[in-house]
């Protein structure tokens, strides 16, 4: 009579993670009498999955009736499979004694476990940086199998193509890690501009996962200063304006000198937005000329976003204004951002 | 008592080929179940293949194709012939009388060292 054979059919076997797998083996002849043992791995390192004979094993059941005497299907159904289950799976069949004896196994069979990946999330640098400058981005996903993925990047639906991209670990693994750095030249219209970092996996049937950053946690637009000098309002009076145009974030603080004294400070609040996602905001003086006998230099100082102050300045010349008598006094404030100079 | 002896192990350079013999003492060998076992510097034992009573034969995934076990029941000596060997193979090499149930302690020989190598 031939020897008995165990036969496990599936070389490899294929499931989603939450899924049950259902491990194949048969047996060739019901002699030598002796149980079936599952095992994931062999030798030193392997680990129970099933015994025959005795023990608990509440994520396995046999897909026929094991304990029947003439059973030659020993084929098991392994429940809410994780990536954790991936391995080698051998079907053992041992020879009844004191102790059992192992007298055969199956060639194996390979669970591979396809496990979605992560939503992939996308950081930006600490620091704001300004136009012109190159940043990077990174972009991380974990818990995937098997270990193909395919990740691109996108500025405002534009490929990039200056990204590095590295899947670990190296060797096998139960589950996998993808981590992308890319570099992003900013322009001053980035404001309302997205970096999407976009992953595509075997089992996520065509339709990849995003994640995103905003450049507007990253840019910082500097403001153009322009200080101009109105016609005269009111006898003996200028109105001087300094636009600050262009910028981004809105946190501004702007202050007046008056030959270099500080004469009002205040913070951008009432700003206009453009189009491009950038602020303007315009602060003004109404000065008194006739409380001046020179000429007054006045100076538009802005300090946005924690950086070092920019400044513009003005001269305004008292010799062309006709000085009145007794007119030293101050001129009445008719707006929120005036300011008389005495 | 079990007494297990592997030999035939030495430097090779990559794609070349080794063959280790087991020759085993104290226990019925022919009925044995019996298997190769590997453990590199620093790393932890490793299942290499084993083969039955009767010839037939289960190999563990990295080594399919390029390894072979064989025995000689008439000189209680199982084989393992070792073909496009790699640098990974480098490792002490030891058997048991055991297959796939071998525990740490089945492999009690002294082993013997291949290393791959240009």
């Known amino acids: 009579e031939e020897e008995l054979q165990v036969i496990q059919p599936d070389k490899s076997v294929s499931v989603a993670a939450g899924e049950s797998a259902i491990l194949h083996c048969t047996v060739t002849s019901l002699i030598p009498v002796g149980p079936i043992q599952w095992f994931r791995g062999a030798g030193p390192a392997r680990e129970l999955i099933y015994n025959q004979k005795e023990g608990h094993f509440p994520r396995v059941t046999t897909v026929s009736e094991s304990t029947k005497r003439e059973n030659m299907d020993f084929s098991i159904s392994i429940s809410n499979i994780t990536p954790a289950d991936a391995g080698t799976y051998y079907c053992v069949k041992f020879r009844k004694g004191s102790p059992d004896t192992e007298f055969k196994s199956g060639a194996g069979t390979e669970l591979s476990v396809r496990a979605k990946p992560s939503a992939p999330v996308v950081s930006g640098p600490a620091a704001r940086a300004t136009p012109q400058h190159t940043v990077s981005f990174t972009c991380e996903s974990h818990g995937f199998s098997p270990r193909d993925i395919t990740l691109k990047w996108f500025k405002n639906g534009n490929e990039l193509s200056d990204f590095q991209t590295n899947v670990d670990p190296v060797g096998e693994s139960v589950s996998y890690s993808i981590h992308s750095t890319a570099k992003v030249v900013l322009t001053r219209e980035d404001v309302h501009s997205q970096v999407i970092c976009e992953v595509a996996h075997v089992t996520l049937q065509g339709d990849p996962l995003r994640g995103t950053a905003n450049l507007s946690e990253t840019i910082r637009v500097p403001p153009t200063l322009e200080v101009t000098q109105q016609p005269v309002r009111a006898e003996n009076q200028v109105n001087v304006t300094c636009q600050v145009r262009k910028f981004y974030p809105q946190r501004l603080q702007l202050t007046w000198l008056e030959n270099g004294n500080v004469s009002r400070t205040e913070t951008a609040s009432t700003v206009t937005e453009n189009k491009d996602g950038t602020y303007n905001w315009m602060s003004w003086l109404l000065v008194n000329v006739s409380a001046h006998r020179d000429d007054v230099k006045l100076t538009c100082q802005v300090e946005h976003d924690g950086q070092p102050a920019v400044s513009k300045s003005h001269d305004l010349k008292v010799s062309a204004h006709p000085k009145e008598q007794g007119s030293n006094t101050a001129a009445e404030n008719t707006g929120s951002n005036e300011r008389n100079i005495y | 008592h079990v007494q297990l002896v592997e030999s035939g192990g030495g430097l090779v350079q990559p794609g070349g080929s080794l063959r280790l013999s087991c020759a085993a003492r104290g226990f019925s060998f022919r009925d044995s179940a019996m298997s190769w076992a590997r453990q590199a510097p620093g790393k932890g034992l490793e299942w290499v293949g084993a083969?039955?009573?009767?010839?037939?034969?289960v190999y563990e995934k990295s080594v399919k194709g390029r390894f072979t076990i064989s025995r000689d029941n008439a000189k209680n000596t199982m084989y393992l012939q070792m073909h496009s060997l790699k640098p990974e193979d480098s490792a002490r090499y030891y058997c048991?009388?055991?297959?796939?149930?071998?525990?740490?302690?089945?492999?009690s020989g002294q082993g013997t060292l291949v290393t791959v190598s240009s």
């Open positions: 083969i039955y009573s009767d010839g037939s034969t």
């Open positions: 048991a009388p055991k297959g796939v149930v071998a525990d740490e302690g089945d492999y």
